[in-house]
């Protein structure tokens, strides 16, 4: 194989659908890693800085999009209440096993070394409250109290 085909993934995190939250009181975050080659990746979910395994469903293997491109998806399911807390932080991390420091790499593009690529999101209050305004509200309430 031509080592120049080695490519790290682009990682995207998709927020839960309003329909799922309304109908099932559950919230599924979807992580998508695309465009990587070869298919040497490990995907993990982190909530509030800690790795989680409960509620996680990851594709059993990467799907071949084209000759030199794979994709992998994973889902994290949490309660709607948990998702609606804007202080909760969600991160999907993909470790891509690329080239080592010893591997040669030609001029013209960055060397795709082993690396971690992440996508993240904060929980969303269902009335348009942001993390900042939520924390400001908590601070105000504490002062008033």
């Amino acid at each position: 194989e031509d080592l120049r085909n080695v490519t790290p993934p682009k990682v995207s995190l998709f927020e839960p659908s309003k329909a799922e939250i309304a109908n099932k009181q559950k919230a599924t975050l979807v992580c998508l890693a695309r465009g990587f080659f070869p298919d040497h990746v490990e995907l993990s979910w982190w909530v509030n800085g800690k790795e989680v395994h409960s509620g996680v469903s990851t594709d059993p293997q990467a799907y071949k999009e084209s000759n030199y491109s794979y994709c992998l998806s994973s889902r994290l399911r949490v309660s709607a209440t948990f998702w609606h807390n804007p202080r909760n932080h969600f991160r999907c991390q993909v470790q891509f096993h690329g080239l080592s420091e010893e591997d040669k790499w030609p001029e013209g593009s960055p060397k795709p070394v082993t690396q971690n690529i992440s996508a993240e999101a904060w929980g969303r209050a269902d009335c348009g409250i942001t993390s900042a305004s939520y924390q400001q509200g908590v601070l105000s309430a504490t002062i008033l109290y």
Epitope: R4, E102, K104, P106, E107, G108, S109, P110
Partner: antibody, heavy 120, light 108 residues
Framework: EVYLVESGGDLVQPGSSLKVSCAAS????????MYWVRQAPGKGLEWVGR??????????EYADSVRGRFTISRDDSRNSIYLQMNRLRVDDTAIYYC???????????WGQGTMVTVSS | YELIQPSSASVTVGETVKITCSGD??????AYWFQQKSDKNILLLIY???KRPSGIPERFSGSTSGTTATLTISGAQPEDEAAYYC???????????FGSGTQLTVLR
């Protein structure tokens, strides 16, 4: 067809400034890192510097002999790179070439060069 | 950092000649080879140690072993009379450096 065309070479005095250009066509310019190479009369090739593309924040690197005096820039909308040369010295006299390198193409096309002469 | 090449080499038409390029970073970084004839045009002959671009005759080949890269011309032709340069990179920034160049004379 890929073309690289350098221009702007001139006869200038030591200590002065000059800006030379390289216009590219026939390929997706923004996908490529671009390079300046020079050749003094009767001498060998010398790497001057490179400018990377936007995914690499247009990072530049320079040879020790020109660092601090020369600046490479690029304009992806014009498919062009530039070499701003300040505090020119007699030993900067050379033909200046541009070339390209990308993920699957490395130094495969070169311009015809533009002559810069620094003399009093 | 330097890439060391012999300043000159000669070969009889139809014979084989090897041009070397030595540098202590060559085990870590790829070598490229270029030809420059008297018209000053620069032509890529070999990239990534041993790959030949389309359109380059098969008589040109490249190899590396340890700290030495080698350009081999098998069955040299009169039109191969030219200067040959190796190129590689070094250091944290992958700065580039050319070899000092080898002037090849093809004897009839």
């Amino acid at each position: 067809e890929v073309y690289l065309v350098e221009s702007g070479g001139d006869l200038v005095q030591p200590g002065s400034s000059l800006k030379v250009s390289c216009a590219a066509s026939g390929f997706t310019f923004s996908d490529f890192w671009m390079y300046w190479v020079r050749q003094a009369p009767g001498k060998g090739l010398e790497w001057v510097g490179r400018i990377k593309n936007i995914p690499n924040n247009y990072a530049t690197e320079y040879a020790d002999s020109v660092r601090g005096r020369f600046t490479i820039s690029r304009d992806d909308s014009r498919n062009s790179i530039y070499l701003q040369m300040n505090r020119l010295r007699v030993d900067d006299t050379a033909i200046y070439y541009c070339t390209r390198a990308g993920r699957f193409d490395h130094f495969d096309y070169w311009g015809q060069g533009t002559m810069v002469t620094v003399s009093s | 950092y330097e890439l060391i090449q012999p300043s000159s080499a000669s070969v009889t038409v139809g014979e084989t000649v090897k041009i070397t390029c030595s540098g202590d970073q060559l085990p870590k970084n790829f070598a490229y080879w270029f030809q420059q004839k008297s018209d000053k045009n620069i032509l890529l002959l070999i990239y990534m140690d041993n790959k030949r671009p389309s359109g380059i005759p098969e008589r040109f080949s490249g190899s590396t072993s340890g700290t030495t890269a080698t350009l081999t011309i098998s069955g040299a032709q009169p039109e191969d009379e030219a200067a040959y340069y190796c190129l590689s990179s070094y250091g944290d920034n992958n700065d580039l450096v050319f070899g000092s160049g080898t002037q090849l004379t093809v004897l009839r």
